[in-house]
Interface confidence: low
């Protein structure tokens, strides 16, 4: 017990000399936050000058204080022992570490490209200032019908599946028994929709090959230069709206 | 901030790539512009560089510029320098927007000179 | 390529007048908004005064204001002051077949 308590007291005595030695060694070390180690004036603690600051104590310099200029704002003043800290002016919102960055806010119902905030496309929406278009829920994939029809805002709203709402349905539908699949009303559903969406898709090539014919090339190369760039659709300056080909909603295509 | 280097004088013919070093913000959230103004003459929009990479030049500097990036830097060479690309060349940071330029570099000169 | 043109070239103001400055567009800007002010002072970078035609730079005082839509726009100063002796620039941006340009600018000086 009393060798214990004799190696506690060692290490105590031991430290505290370290730390006297240190000062001694390196008055530095007895600068304060706020405060500058000034090698020009023999190792005096200076004040920081005028936006600068020092988060912490021992410092042989003090760091400029971020300034918050053009579309930042600032949300804390700087002071001698902390930083500034902005935000994004009002139609900006912040991203990054730290609100590095201020990125345009659109609307709800648009979502931000290359040049500015365009709305949602048909088929999808954005019920934020920020982020992208993001299309509506396919209730079908769930064996469901939409209840609510979707907007540039909101998503559609799912209900309950056509079956469930035939008369004299009971609410919790039983496992429909075993057929023969040709007889399937999904599967003949699936098999109409697939049709009609291969047939919409040959009716938008057909338009986006005329409307490059018209427009010239140029338009064409943009939208494929840029996977990652949620292009402008060729047809912009009629609707407006900022489209991304569904192969590239999963993150761009190769071509 | 954004401060450009690599301005000089040079030979008519030669090649020139002036940098645009960046710092505070990334550029894989920023587009950053070129634009330069002549002696006595008005500023003019020269090329463009997507956080994506994707790049855009006026016509009239299409295959005289090229832009290119790294991680903190955006590099515009001059690929055969004339007289009339003597300027002041700025570069500048925008958000989101190409027209909203909010931070620039103090400028470089360029002199193309026999 | 679209064609930027400002008027007037040069105007002549006096401390605590108004003066208004108008770009005109060959084609609409994109999205109709597109269009951005700059000043311009020697041996400086350009400062943004004005973006999406009408929304005030942070940091700008409210003297500073811009309109317009589409092809025609203006930008006015009112209460000039001293240091508003510059040169001022439209900056349009066009679909992406059209180049993005300046306007020829306005020099702004005191009587």
């Known amino acids: 017990m009393g060798n214990s308590c004799y190696n506690i007291v060692a290490t105590l005595l031991l430290v505290l000399n370290f730390e006297r030695t240190r000062s001694l060694q390196d008055p530095c070390s007895n600068c304060p936050a706020g405060t500058f180690c000034d090698n020009n004036r023999n190792q005096i603690c200076s004040p920081c000058p005028p936006n600068s600051f020092s988060s912490a104590g021992g410092q042989r310099t003090c760091d400029i204080c971020r300034q918050c200029k053009g579309v930042f704002r600032t949300r804390k003043e700087c002071s001698s022992t902390s930083n500034a800290e902005c935000d994004c002016t009002p139609g900006f919102h912040c991203l990054g570490a730290g609100c590095s960055m201020c990125e345009q806010d659109c609307k709800q119902g648009q979502e931000l490209t290359k040049k500015g905030c365009k709305d949602c496309c048909f088929g999808t929406f954005n019920d934020q200032k920020r982020g992208i278009c993001r299309p509506w829920t396919n209730c079908s994939l769930d064996g469901k019908s939409v209840l609510v029809n979707g907007t540039k805002e909101r998503d559609v709203v799912c209900g309950p599946s056509p079956a469930d709402l035939s008369p004299g349905a009971s609410s919790v539908t039983p496992p429909a028994p075993a057929r023969e699949p040709g007889h399937s009303p999904q599967i003949i559903s699936f098999f109409l929709a697939l049709t009609s969406t291969a047939l919409l898709f040959l009716l938008f090539f057909l338009t986006l090959r005329f409307s490059v014919v018209k427009r010239g090339r140029k338009k064409l190369l943009y939208i494929f230069k840029q996977p990652f760039m949620r292009p402008v659709q060729t047809t912009q300056e009629e609707d407006g709206c900022s489209c991304r080909f569904p192969e590239e909603e999963e993150g761009g295509c190769e071509l | 901030s954004l401060e450009e280097s690599g301005g000089r004088l040079v030979t008519p013919g030669g090649s020139l790539t002036l940098t645009c070093t960046v710092s505070g913000f990334s550029l894989n959230n920023n587009a950053i512009s070129w634009v330069r103004q002549a002696p006595g003459k008005g500023l003019e929009w020269v090329a463009i560089i997507q956080n994506t990479g994707t790049t855009d030049y006026a016509r009239w500097a299409k295959g005289r510029f090229t832009i290119s990036k790294t991680s903190t830097t955006v590099d515009l060479k001059i690929n055969s320098p004339t007289t009339e690309d003597t300027a002041t060349y700025f570069c500048g940071r925008g958000y989101g927007f190409e027209s909203e330029l909010v931070i620039w570099g103090p400028g470089t000169l360029v002199t193309v000179s026999s | 390529a679209a064609v930027l043109t400002q008027t007037p070239s040069s105007t002549s103001a006096a401390v605590g007048g108004t003066v208004t400055i108008s770009c005109q567009s060959s084609q609409s800007v994109y999205n109709n908004n597109a269009l951005a002010w700059y000043q311009k002072k020697p041996g400086q970078p350009p400062k943004l005064l004005i973006y999406l035609a009408s929304t005030l730079a942070s940091g700008v005082p409210s003297r500073f204001s811009g309109s317009g839509s589409g092809t025609q726009f203006t930008l006015t100063i009112s209460d000039l002051e001293c240091d508003d002796a510059a040169t001022y620039y439209c900056?349009?941006?066009?679909?992406?077949?059209?180049?993005?340009?300046f306007g020829g600018g306005t020099e702004v000086v005191f009587k």
């Open positions: 900056l349009g941006v066009y679909n992406d077949d059209v180049d993005n340009g």
